[in-house]
Every structure is written in C-alpha cells, then in structure tokens.
C-alpha cells in the first residue's frame, strides 16, 4: 500500500493571467490541500500541459462547468 502520509502534494503558487479557450481543455482537478498556500484548479490541456488557475475567476468556474457537462455526454 502506498504511504499516503508521505505522498507528494501538488500546489499552485501562481495563476495564469490568460483566459484559456475551453476547446483547449481536456480535464481539471482541484487543489484543496491545507498544505498549499492557495486553493487552485489545475487544468490539463488537450496537449497534456497543466495550468494553474484561480477558482474564484468566472472563466475558471465556467470552464469547470463545461468540462463537468462533458462527463455526462456519452462520446460516440
């Protein structure tokens, strides 16, 4: 079993200051660890690049909503 206590924590220290087109986004994950200085969202792009974003920004919230919606739509 992996040792969860020693598992590395991913944190975001800076946020992107550019709005990313939802067409470029593949997925997201939230960073909520108390060990991190900021709550954050990490978007993964379709070319597997990871970008830190501020969850308080509306475009970030809208992008998360868009990606959530995609999980409900069967891909054919």
């Amino acid at each position: 079993q992996p040792d969860a206590i020693n598992a590395p924590v991913t944190c975001c220290y800076n946020f992107t200051n550019r709005k990313i087109s939802v067409q470029r986004l593949a997925s997201y994950r939230r960073i909520t660890s108390s060990k991190c200085p900021k709550e954050a969202v990490i978007f993964k792009t379709i070319v597997a690049k990871e970008i830190c974003a501020d969850p308080k920004q509306k475009w970030v919230q809208d992008s998360m909503d868009h990606l959530d919606k995609q999980t409900q739509t069967p891909k054919t």
């Epitope: 709550e39 919230q61 809208d62 998360m64 909503d65 959530d68 919606k69 999980t71 409900q72």
Partner: nanobody
Framework: EVQLVESGGGLVQAGGSLRLSCAAS????????MGWFRQAPGKEREFVAS????????YYADSVKGRFTISRDNAKNTVYLQMNSLKSEDTAVYYC????????????????WGQGTQVTVSS
Amino acid sequence: EVQLVESGGGLVQAGGSLRLSCAASGRSFSSHRMGWFRQAPGKEREFVASISRSGENTYYADSVKGRFTISRDNAKNTVYLQMNSLKSEDTAVYYCAASGGMGISAPNSYAYWGQGTQVTVSS
C-alpha cells in the same frame, strides 16, 4: 475546506412539499458545483440533483424529474432543494455535497458532504 449544514427535513404526508436548504461556509462557494444525494435505509447513497457553479445548468435523477427543483444563491452561500409531490419512496436522509473534481452525478466527484437531514414521507 468547505463546511455544509443541511436543514428543512421532516415528516410530511404523501403529495406534500418540503424545501431543503444547505448553508456553506469556508472557501469560495461559487467555485463549487453543488449536489443533493439521498440514502434510504439499507440502500446505497444515490444522486438526486446537481447545479452548476453559475446556476444555469441543473441535472436530476429520473426518479425526481418534474417534482424536485435545485437552485442556489451564491450571495447567501446556500443551495436549495424544493421537493413537491413527495412519495413514500422519497423517504431517506438527504445530503448536500460540494464538488471536488470533474463530474456531475458520481458521489466520488464530490469532496465535501454535510451530515444529512431526514425526510420521511408517510402514506
């Protein structure tokens, strides 16, 4: 960290209505998709309804469509579940949840949970 407290449950007759509320405290409420789930005795926790961060998109389990309405007030950090035309099969503990990852109806896409409020529908 997000703390969630549900209220509004109780005993109601079949055909009646209840409005559940879920008050959130902690980090940015508007950055979380919110959902309601329920768990009846001896059954697994099941998805009831979910609302997007903007409040523009709502999703419902087939069993509650047309009877239940989810809404949110980001200024008050509160999400609501209006339940009409209640049936005995709606009897359960109702849980409010805040998202932790991608997804809409899967319980494991919600990271934060309230303690639940009991809804009992008598026939």
